[in-house]
């Protein structure tokens, strides 16, 4: 029995619903009484949802899963996962048994966009050319972990004296804090870019230092 799932991971935003597609080709005369369907976590073998003896056996996974009962007879064994969480990320295996048996695994990739970075400066007054300042770029509640890039006003990458740390909250979402230590020129703009590698989403923040006063666009 051939079981088909998408090759590419299913990308779902945290808090949204995701459909993990799985299909099989029923033979003529197929009835749901013959169908055994099991969805489980690929690595741990934890049961997620099942269908047997002509009946939906329900969710074994936090009551957030559902099948598409009206479409099962046509060979649609897809699973709906509601209110996606970071912890849901991973591989799910769809097992289908009628007379024959088949299985395939589909990957769920969870993502959450990062907030627009907030920029802070230390020290933040009485600055002169030649002073060393610490610029902190903070962006919140994204997933997966971010890449952070710094550049100056001319677009030249700044890679030295950068320290980036990640903090995961109880929901598994990351707060990212990146610190740039730089010696001030006469004036200058310093930008940070926080990139979500899954969503290919870039969040930008910048600070312009023009002697006095400073501006935070």
């Amino acid at each position: 029995l051939e079981v088909q799932v998408p090759e590419d991971p299913v990308v779902a935003l945290v808090g949204t619903d995701a459909t993990l597609c799985c299909s099989f080709s029923p033979e003529p005369g197929f009835s749901l009484a013959q169908l055994n369907l099991i969805w489980q976590l690929t690595d741990t073998k934890q049961l997620v949802h099942s269908f047997a003896e002509g009946q939906d056996q329900g969710s074994a996974y936090a009551n957030r899963t559902a099948l598409f009962p009206d479409l099962l007879a046509q060979g649609n064994a897809s699973l709906r996962l509601q209110r996606v969480r970071v912890a849901d990320e991973g591989s799910f295996t769809c097992f289908v048994s009628i007379r024959d048996f088949g299985s395939a695994a589909v990957s769920l990739q969870v993502a959450a966009p990062y907030s627009k970075p907030s920029m802070t400066l230390e020290p933040n007054k009485d600055l002169r050319p030649g002073d060393t300042v610490t610029i902190t770029c903070s962006s919140y509640r994204g997933y997966p972990e971010a890449e952070v890039f710094w550049q100056d006003g001319q677009g030249v990458p700044l890679t030295g004296n950068v320290t980036t740390s990640q903090m995961a909250n109880e929901q598994g979402l990351f707060d990212v804090h990146s610190v740039l230590r730089v010696v001030l020129g006469a004036n200058g703009t310093y930008s940070c870019l926080v990139r979500n590698p899954v969503l290919q989403q870039d969040a930008h923040g910048s600070v312009t230092i023009t002697g006095q006063p400073m501006t935070f666009p």
Epitope: D43, V86, P144, Q166, A168, E170, G172
Partner: antibody, heavy 121, light 108 residues
Framework: DVQLVESGGGVVRPGESLRLSCAAS????????MNWVRQAPGEGLEWVSR?????????YYADSVKGRFTISRDNSKNTLYLQMNSLRAEDTAVYYC?????????????WGLGTLVTVSS | EIVLTQSPGNLSLSPGERATLSCRAS??????LGWYQQKPGQAPRLLIY???TRATGIPDRFSGSGSGTEFALTISSLQSEDFAVYYC??????????FGGGTKVEIK
């Protein structure tokens, strides 16, 4: 069963290089962040480096190895690597490969048996 | 960098006794703390994650508690196989991921 098997350790002189490998099996390797943790003889545990999952290759290092060590992974071979350059006597340790429990929770739920690296003149 | 301080450094107890190990963080780590057991010549083994959740296959005589900066690992009744070194580890703010210095539980 999850298995992590390190290899590549040995005795080298200060300033030399070594490449450690960790062969993983029993789980979907590409779906998990992976780490190297070391333990000097008679000492405690020290995290060395982490690489995130999939092919994003976002890497982190302890200050003590930054600029000298490079972590990488080959998801097609289910293998994690640690390239160690400019080795110092203080790098002498058992190096463990460790799997992150999830991609945002970096506890280490599975460890290899370790491979010993000795840096001595 | 978050520093984890474990106490005591050594704990001498008899089989059947209760062991309480402490781990203090230099700043809050929420509940993002793990405990590991290491026996001589072996790799560490995860016991507890999320401050209080037992890892797969870990006996229920091991329990973790605490949040913020103060954590404890309790072994309700020590078995001969429990004599080992125990480490705590935070994964709240990284890099670096940091470990405590360890507590050695030895037979009295």
């Amino acid at each position: 069963d999850v298995q992590l098997v390190e290899s590549g350790g040995g005795v080298v002189r200060p300033g030399e290089s070594l490449r450690l490998s960790c062969a993983a099996s029993g789980f979907t390797f590409s779906n998990y962040a992976m780490n190297w943790v070391r333990q000097a003889p008679g000492e405690g545990l020290e995290w060395v480096s982490r690489i995130n999952y999939k092919g994003y290759n976002i890497t982190y290092y302890a200050d003590s190895v930054k600029g000298r060590f490079t972590i990488s992974r080959d998801n097609s071979k289910n293998t994690l690597y640690l390239q160690m350059n400019s080795l110092r006597a203080e790098d002498t340790a058992v190096y463990y490969c460790a799997k992150s429990g999830s991609n945002s929770n970096n506890f280490f739920d599975y460890w290899g048996l370790g491979t010993l690296v000795t840096v001595s003149s | 960098e978050i520093v984890l301080t474990q106490s005591p450094g050594n704990l001498s107890l008899s089989p059947g006794e209760r062991a309480t190990l402490s781990c203090r963080a230099s700043q809050s780590v929420g509940s993002q703390l793990g405990w590991y057991q290491q026996k001589p010549g072996q790799a560490p083994r995860l016991l507890i994650y999320g401050a209080s959740t037992r890892a797969t296959g870990i006996p229920d005589r091991f329990s973790g508690s605490g949040s913020g900066t103060e954590f404890a690992l309790t072994i309700s009744s020590l078995q001969s196989e429990d004599f080992a070194v125990y480490y705590c580890q935070q994964y709240y703010d990284w890099p670096p991921l940091t470990f405590g210095g360890g507590t050695k539980v030895e037979i009295k």
